[in-house]
């Protein structure tokens, strides 16, 4: 957020940057929450994004029986391990079709008995106020995949017709980790000081992070002809004076017409 | 990345024989899964014979006691002896491999595959 400077006075606007802003020759530049001339107004709102997508990720372990372990496939980089991947990568591909959040599959490791398979499922979703509950049916939903699919495809006289056959009782989900995202929490970090002022209200399922002097939301303070400004002990009306009228109050709302305290004093003089 | 080159195939007669070789190329030869594949016009491709370097075979029930599959790792080939040939072993054979010791039937776990050679039964 800048404000520039012209004339001669912005040599002393050089040195009164407030905030942490820095001088550039022209104008302060101000840091994410602040803005004005010398950087001294905090902002009304901040941009905390969300995020287009929230991701998760499902440790999983699956043994398939229609490929014989060899040492080779410890090894990335082998031939042997490449066109493991690339059979397993298109057999997951086709089991979890029908998830629209599932991403794809990452093996971490392959190991003995007959092959181990430890890996893990991606999954990702837009971002919604629901994301948690979305990701979580998607979770059920790879869980009963892998579970049909390997109790379906399974060696018979020890052939398999499948891309792929699976021990039965090797399934395992290890863990599932989805990634964390708390508007509330980035509001109050992204609000520093002024962190117990700042509030996420949402709008068209879009979080805002936003503090009383921002207009337009249930908890915007209303200084009707006054200004709002945060300070460090929340935020405050500060009443305008017209022509007419001094204003006072909490917000503003406490209208002294001049000429009848002129008159007051005039009086008592 | 592995090179396979078919030959062999031909028109003969029921009862006849004919035997189909693989070319290989690359150093992968002596290890993994090697296998006959064929495919009849309008039909899915199906697997004929399989072998594997820790020497497990496979035949199809229809091909059994009449075809046999070898390998000549020296040569980096691997063949495909037919007897008793019959009109329904007519197709285009297919040679496929994969460096996985494999124990499956299906066509989409394996890797490599030749350009396949015709095979034609009749009299």
């Known amino acids: 957020r800048t404000t520039t400077c012209f004339g001669d006075g912005c040599q002393n606007t050089a040195s009164r940057c407030k905030n942490g802003g820095t001088w550039d020759g022209l104008k302060c530049q101000c840091p994410n929450l602040y803005y004005g001339e010398l950087c001294e107004e905090v902002v009304s709102s901040i941009d905390i994004g969300p995020p287009e997508t929230i991701s998760a990720q499902m440790e999983l372990t699956v043994t398939v029986t229609s490929v014989k372990f060899t040492e080779e496939l410890k090894n990335h980089s082998s031939q042997e391990f490449q066109e493991f991947k690339q059979t397993f990568t298109e057999q997951m591909n086709i089991v979890y079709s029908g998830i629209p959040e599932y991403v794809g599959v990452n093996i971490t490791k392959l190991r003995l008995g007959s092959v181990v398979v430890e890996h893990d499922v991606l999954l990702r979703t837009k971002y919604t106020p629901e994301y948690k509950t979305v990701l979580d049916n998607a979770t059920e939903v790879v869980k009963e995949k892998i579970t049909k699919v390997t109790t379906q495809q399974i060696m018979i006289n020890d052939i398999c017709s499948d891309m792929m056959c699976f021990n039965t009782t090797g399934t395992q989900v290890q863990n599932i980790t989805v990634t964390q995202y708390d508007p509330e929490e980035d509001c109050r970090k992204m609000a520093k000081e002024y962190g117990d002022y700042f509030v996420v209200e949402y709008r068209d399922q879009k979080p805002y992070c936003i503090s009383p002097c921002e207009p337009g939301f249930s908890v915007s303070k209303n200084c009707n002809l006054g200004k709002c400004q945060m300070s460090l002990s929340g935020p405050q009306c500060l009443c305008v004076t017209t022509e007419t009228h001094w204003y006072s109050g909490e917000t503003c709302n406490q209208g002294t017409q001049k000429s009848l305290v002129y008159g007051h004093h005039h009086h008592h003089h | 990345e592995v090179q396979l080159v078919e030959s062999g195939g031909g028109v003969v007669q029921p009862g006849g024989s004919l035997r189909l070789s693989c070319a290989a190329s690359?150093?992968?030869?002596?290890?993994?899964?090697w296998g006959w594949f064929r495919q009849a016009p309008g039909k899915e491709r199906e697997a004929v014979a399989l072998?594997?370097?820790?020497?497990?075979?496979f035949y199809a029930d229809s091909v059994k006691g009449r075809f046999t599959i070898s390998q000549d790792n020296s040569k980096n080939t691997l063949y495909l002896q037919m007897n008793s040939l019959r009109a329904e072993d007519t197709a285009m054979y297919y040679c496929?491999?994969?460096?996985?010791?494999?124990?499956?039937?299906?066509?989409?776990?394996?890797?490599?595959w030749g350009q396949g050679t015709q095979v034609t039964v009749s009299s």
């Open positions: 072998i594997s370097s820790d020497g497990w075979t």
């Open positions: 496929a491999a994969s460096v996985l010791v494999l124990r499956t039937l299906n066509p989409k776990a394996w890797h490599h």
């Open positions: 690359g150093d992968t030869f002596s290890r993994g899964s």
